[in-house]
Interface confidence: low
């Protein structure tokens, strides 16, 4: 069974998939559609790297631009380095500025809803 066939079989279960399953899926050439991606748990999407999301979506990665103001894409963008987002070439804005350090402080995020940024 190829990656696409496997994806079709498990598509209906993906809404609650944890991060590790999504990371594994990104290596299987599944080309997840945007509608499915938008239904994923935000907390499962946030830890994914730009490269992992790009592999997960395949040719559908361009759809991130249309969804950049909506969860989970909006929250995921806020967690990525702007440099990394720029490699997608989609004009996604709102990433962590170059030279900033991300402190993964759960309390800070609970209060503000965004990662804590330290300047250079």
């Amino acid at each position: 069974m190829n990656g696409s066939e496997y994806f079709v079989k498990i598509q209906s279960f993906l809404g609650g998939a944890p991060t590790e399953d999504l990371k594994a899926l990104s290596q299987q050439n599944v080309s997840m559609d945007l509608a499915t991606f938008m239904k994923l748990r935000t907390d499962a999407v946030l830890p994914l790297t730009v490269a992992e999301v790009q592999k997960l979506l395949g040719p559908h990665v361009e759809g991130l631009k249309a969804e950049e103001r909506h969860r989970p894409v909006r929250d995921w963008i806020l967690r990525q380095r702007q440099d990394d987002l720029d490699t997608l070439g989609l004009g996604l804005q709102g990433g962590i500025p170059n030279g900033y350090l991300v402190l993964d402080l759960s309390m800070q995020e609970a209060l503000s809803g965004t990662p804590c940024l330290l300047g250079p």
Partner: antibody, heavy 120, light 107 residues
Amino acid sequence: EVQLVQSGAEVKKPGASVKVSCKASGYTFTSYWMHWVRQAPGQRLEWMGNVNPSSGGSNYNEKFKNRVTITVDKSASTAYMELSSLRSEDTAVYYCAPHYIGSRPGFAYWGQGTLVTVSS
Amino acid sequence: DIVMTQSPDSLAVSLGERATINCKASQNVGTNIAWYQQKPGQSPKALIYSASYRYSGVPDRFSGSGSGTDFTLTISSLQAEDVAVYYCQQYNSYPLTFGGGTKVEIK
């Protein structure tokens, strides 16, 4: 902001060659294929070929394979399309259009076009 | 090569009315289709990719649908600025190919 600035209009004699340039800015040049598409007066758009600026790899439309050469100058973020053995039916507007290497080639950005006129 | 056949060649629609353009691929291209708008003397402008996704900044009156071999671009309420030629393009396989274009005018 993505910008693609093409060289100016050219008038050529049949049998001659023409080299059109496309200077790119606003994105990472080596992260995008550069495609060339032409449009003869009143005709449909016609894909000619592309080049991967990172690897130098290319694909050509068989129709042009022996006459077209697509190259890049990475240091200048510029792509070139050279068409040889020109004939009157090569009179057309030639466009450059990039697409992100990791996705399928839909063209969100286009150069302004370069008119090439072939006339004796 | 995959041949993209558009219909109709031209279309006259009243302002505020719906315009529908069809594109048929000679073989299955999945949803690997884009739609472009071209006004006289201008470069093509991307409207839709992956058959149904609008590019950023494209008004929501433009929508795309279809998969496999049959695709449709719909302008739900035609505006004066929509007068143009519309092209479909398949990017399922090389060589990339375009439809012959549909000219949309105001009735």
